[in-house]
């Protein structure tokens, strides 16, 4: 969490941002809130990116104002116009690109004063893994697949019964480049699995950590997946 305060002249206002991560090819949100004003027409929101000449987005007098917008953000940005009045200056970003990563500044002017806060935005690819029993294999084998990751993640297997065991010798992980030549499909196979045990396939890079669990008993198979973004810090 980054909390910024206004500078000279008028009173300062508090602006708060949260570091976040964007999944390339999907839509992202850069979070920013501020002390609200009574009149929408008195609020100016400017989003800037370090190293970029033009603006990312500007909203003033109740409307978007993109005359100074940088070409790389054309057609890809919007604020939540109906929420600006309550202090939400968060930015919607369409079709997140790797090059969108960097330091952004959320700069606010209201009748109460000015304020700004920076936000670190990471970009990459992350997806939920799915673990299945590989019935084609000669021995009891599990197959963990996740369609989109970038940068290349690490894959670690764990089991409830053999806690702390190292499965690197009995697993094999491969990374297959997807058609857009950036993200990769992750496939990891675990051999010699035993029944009545819960196995976890953990995929992690510097942006996200995802886990796919599978519990195999004689009567049923139970699966569970979850994904967690790393380093979501507020400013």
């Amino acid at each position: 969490l980054i909390i910024g305060f206004g500078i000279s002249g008028r009173h300062s206002i508090t602006v708060t941002t949260v570091a976040s991560a964007g999944n390339i090819g999907e839509d992202g949100i850069l979070s920013c809130t501020f002390e609200p004003d009574i009149k929408l027409s008195d609020i100016v929101i400017q989003w800037l990116k370090e190293g970029v000449l033009g603006l990312v987005h500007e909203f003033k007098e109740g409307k978007d104002e993109l005359s100074e917008q940088d070409e790389m953000f054309r057609g890809r940005t919007a604020v939540f116009a109906d929420q600006v009045i309550v202090g939400n200056a968060s930015l919607r970003l369409k079709n997140v690109q790797l090059t969108d990563a960097g330091t952004y500044k959320c700069y606010i002017i209201t009748s109460k004063g000015k304020g700004n806060a920076n936000l670190e935005y990471k970009t990459g690819a992350f997806s939920m893994p799915e673990v299945n029993v590989d019935y084609n294999a000669s021995s009891e084998t599990l197959r963990c697949e996740a369609p989109r990751w970038f940068p290349q993640p690490t894959v670690v297997w764990a089991s409830q019964v053999d806690q702390g065991a190292n499965f690197s010798e009995v697993s094999n992980t491969s990374f297959e480049l997807n058609s857009e030549n950036v993200t990769m499909k992750v496939v990891s196979v675990l051999y010699n699995v035993t029944i009545n045990n819960t196995y976890s396939c953990m995929i992690e890079n510097d942006i996200a950590k995802a886990t796919g669990d599978i519990k195999v008993t004689e009567s049923e198979i139970k699966r569970r997946s979850h994904l967690q973004l790393l380093n979501s810090k507020a400013s």
């Epitope: 090819g25 978007d64 993109l66 005359s67 070409e71 054309r74 057609g75 369409k94 079709n95 857009e180």
Partner: antibody
Framework: QLQLQESGPGLVKPSETLSLTCTVS??????????WSWIRQHPGKGLEWIGN???????YYNPSLRSRVTMSVDTSKNQFSLKLSSVTAADTAVYYC?????????????WGQGTLVTVSS | DIQMTQSPSTLSASVGDRVTITCRAS??????LAWYQQKPGKAPKLLIY???SLESGVPSRFSGSGSGTEFTLTISSLQPDDFATYYC?????????FGGGTKVEIK
């Protein structure tokens, strides 16, 4: 409500420049929340997006036509224009102007009624 | 450029039928897809935006679904006024592109 109307010559000679204007009524072209587009449709065929313009004059053109396209805007007349140079018979089409829904969502609504431009000597 | 492929190109149906048109993108476009209806000699009319949002004034028999690369437009009960050509369009990234169209004709 917002209405768009295309105007310009219906016949253009090969190698010349096609010029069309879109007049906006019922709203301001200077509303910063929208991009303004040109789209064309060859006879009996599908739709092709030509490009868009913002009220400040910034443009984006479809790379397939970029070398021949120029768009401009006249906020005082509430109009935006399209010029397509070095035309051939392949540029014969119905030309539409349209507004995007927002700065981030460029589904098109409303559209002008379209104007047929024939390229022939 | 992102290629948009519609199927079928022609569809014969009767009043009251449930009609489904498919649009496939050559790469993921998230939910940035619109559907239009066009009648001969007229401009296209926006039906659906953002894959599933119904444009104001469009009858509720029209619905859109899908995300990523696969999308569908469904007309729950075809009416006489619905015989037309339908186009999908992606606005995920420049240059914006349209599908080739699906003509819905009377069986």
């Amino acid at each position: 409500q917002l209405q768009l109307q295309e105007s310009g010559p219906g016949l253009v000679k090969p190698s010349e420049t096609l010029s069309l204007t879109c007049t906006v009524s019922g709203g301001s072209i200077s509303d910063g929340s929208y991009y303004w587009s040109w789209i064309r449709q060859h006879p009996g065929k599908g739709l092709e997006w030509i490009g868009n313009i913002y009220y400040s004059g910034s443009t984006y053109y479809n790379p397939s036509l970029r070398s021949r396209v120029t768009m401009s805007v006249d906020t005082s007349k509430n109009q935006f224009s399209l010029k397509l140079s070095s035309v051939t018979a392949a540029d014969t089409a119905v030309y539409y102007c349209a507004r995007g829904l927002s700065t981030i969502d460029e589904a098109f609504d409303p559209w002008g009624q379209g104007t047929l431009v024939t390229v022939s000597s | 450029d992102i290629q948009m492929t519609q199927s079928p190109s022609t569809l014969s149906a009767s009043v009251g039928d449930r009609v489904t048109i498919t649009c496939r993108a050559s790469q993921s476009i998230s939910s940035w897809l619109a559907w239009y209806q066009q009648k001969p000699g007229k401009a296209p009319k926006l039906l659906i935006y953002k894959a599933s949002s119904l444009e104001s004034g469009v009858p509720s028999r029209f619905s859109g679904s899908g995300s990523g690369t696969e999308f569908t437009l469904t007309i729950s009960s075809l009416q006489p006024d619905d015989f037309a050509t339908y186009y999908c369009q992606q606005d995920n990234s420049y240059p914006y592109t349209f599908g080739g169209g699906t003509k819905v004709e009377i069986k």
